[in-house]
Interface confidence: medium
């Protein structure tokens, strides 16, 4: 049926659009960039991204239409809605602060919440983190008693235990919570890298050709026999 199909008879796709046969008498146009509509008859007015503030653009009869996100208005959604123009958003004497696309209440002392509609209780919920205990010190003030290893006005900061570390023999201090660990070089072990690693036990074949392994602090040596020499009696 191809020769009698609308794609060939009426060439419906305009402005360089490509016609695709869907069935005996239906079709679909793939438009060139810059054109839109069932038959590519409209200029794509959305091509220039006219819609602002995250709004959605659609083209209708060569015109663009913007669907604004909440908090914006105008033909191009370019205007921020000033929610603070409408009284009553913030309760208990809260000050309304207009923001792009929204608003925020700055509450007077003693109130909290999005609309300043809740009474502020310093320790409910507790602002103290990392297991800190909240203690109310006044009508609107609190103090956090931190667990060992933490500090900060809300116990948010880990105390670095490394400044006074006792890692020996080139060990590197790694801070923990109210403690630290020593990352030891290969020749040393133990909590503070003070214990010598016995390489002769770890590597039974450290010395070649009948050489005897002798452990030493921070290393080992080979006692070679039968004319062999070198670090591992291989020469």
């Amino acid at each position: 049926y191809s020769t009698s199909h609308p794609c060939f008879v009426s060439r419906p796709c305009l402005n360089g659009g490509t016609c695709h046969m869907l069935s005996r008498d239906t079709y679909e146009c793939t438009c060139q960039v810059g054109f839109t509509g069932k038959e590519c008859q409209w200029t794509d007015a959305c091509l220039s991204h006219p819609c602002a503030n995250g709004s959605t653009c659609t083209t209708v009869a060569n015109q663009f239409s913007c669907k604004c996100l909440t908090g914006f208005t105008g033909q191009k959604c370019e205007t921020d809605v000033n929610e603070c123009d409408i009284p009553g958003h913030c309760q208990h004497g809260g000050t309304c602060l207009n923001l792009p696309g929204s608003y925020q209440c700055q509450c007077p002392q003693g109130f909290t919440g999005q609309y300043c509609d809740s009474l502020y209780v310093p320790c409910a919920p507790s602002p103290c983190v990392n297991g800190g205990t909240c203690r109310q010190t006044g009508d609107f003030t609190f103090e956090c008693n931190c667990l060992p290893g933490f500090e900060g006005s809300t116990c948010e900061r880990n105390i670095d235990d490394c400044p006074n570390h006792r890692c020996q023999n080139g060990g590197v201090c790694v801070d923990g919570v109210n403690t630290y660990n020593c990352r030891c070089p290969p020749q040393w072990t133990g909590q503070f890298c003070t214990e010598d690693v016995d390489e002769c036990l770890l590597q039974p074949n450290a010395c070649q050709n009948g050489g005897t392994c002798a452990n030493r602090n921070g290393g080992y040596g080979c006692v070679c026999v039968n004319g062999w020499s070198g670090d591992d009696c291989s020469e």
């Epitope: 003030t141 956090c144 900060g152 006005s153 900061r157 880990n158 670095d160």
Partner: antibody, heavy 120, light 107 residues
Framework: EVQLVESGGGLVQPGGSLKLSCAVS????????MEWVRQASGKGLEWVAA??????????VYSASVKDRFTISRDDSKSTLYLQMNSLKTEDTAVYYC???????????WGQGTLVTVSS | DIQMTQSPSSVSASVGDRVTITCQTS??????LAWYQQKPGKSPKLLIY???RLQDGVPSRFSGSGSGTDYTLTISSLQPEDFATYYC?????????FGGGTKVEIK
């Protein structure tokens, strides 16, 4: 409204001294950790020193680059934070900001900054 | 000291673009991370604290995520007023350390 206003910056010769002030208002000064942060021209931010709050005995921490040369202090009666800078070096040239540590891993209020230039 | 590696150092973008900035720390900071915006001649402004919590008054197009040693700041739809330099900062332990900054420029 929380406000921090620094002052005391200026031109000083290497080896010289300068004392910066930061007057605060709009919050209970003694409840908060206070920090000094600096920024050399065209460079990033560098933490300098901190003074903990009253609950933590106003104890002090310094960065390695200023330890033994700079002293942070505060006067609660004047709601003012200070940074005494001695033995100044050319690499101390920067805008110095005082900031309030909000207690949630962020510095939530900053002053406008004061410029310190160390040059001969 | 905890090292902060921020990338990219600069990014060119257009209004409406989605912009992502990353920050990597040399050790686990347990979400103790903040993001700041700074415009030329101005002091830094706190955007995000605790890795993902939006500071009061900051538009919701800014968001933060991450844990452990890897953190991200996302601007979902870049606005003209967002062209600035952004810094990450760890507040998990002293000394406080900052990333090197990311300059967001107009394409």
């Amino acid at each position: 409204e929380v406000q921090l206003v620094e002052s005391g910056g200026g031109l000083v010769q290497p080896g010289g001294s300068l004392k910066l002030s930061c007057a605060v208002s709009g919050f209970t000064f003694s409840d908060f950790y206070m920090e000094w942060v600096r920024q050399a021209s065209g460079k990033g931010l560098e933490w300098v020193a901190a003074q903990r709050n009253k609950a933590n005995d106003f104890s002090i921490v310094y960065s390695a680059s200023v330890k033994d040369r700079f002293t942070i202090s505060r006067d609660d009666s004047k709601s003012t934070l200070y940074l005494q800078m001695n033995s100044l070096k050319t690499e101390d040239t920067a805008v110095y900001y005082c900031s309030r540590d909000g207690g949630r891993w962020g510095l939530d209020a900053w002053g406008q900054g004061t410029l310190v230039t160390v040059s001969s | 000291d905890i090292q902060m590696t921020q990338s990219p150092s600069s990014v060119s973008a257009s209004v409406g673009d989605r912009v992502t900035i990353t920050c990597q720390t040399s050790e686990d900071i347990y979400s103790g991370l903040a993001w700041y915006q700074q415009k030329p001649g101005k002091s830094p402004k706190l955007l995000i604290y605790g890795a993902s919590r939006l500071q009061d008054g900051v538009p919701s197009r800014f968001s933060g995520s991450g844990s452990g040693t890897d953190y991200t700041l996302t601007i979902s739809s870049l606005q003209p007023e967002d062209f600035a330099t952004y810094y990450c900062q760890q507040g998990f332990k002293y000394p406080l350390t900052f990333g090197g900054g990311t300059k967001v420029e107009i394409k």
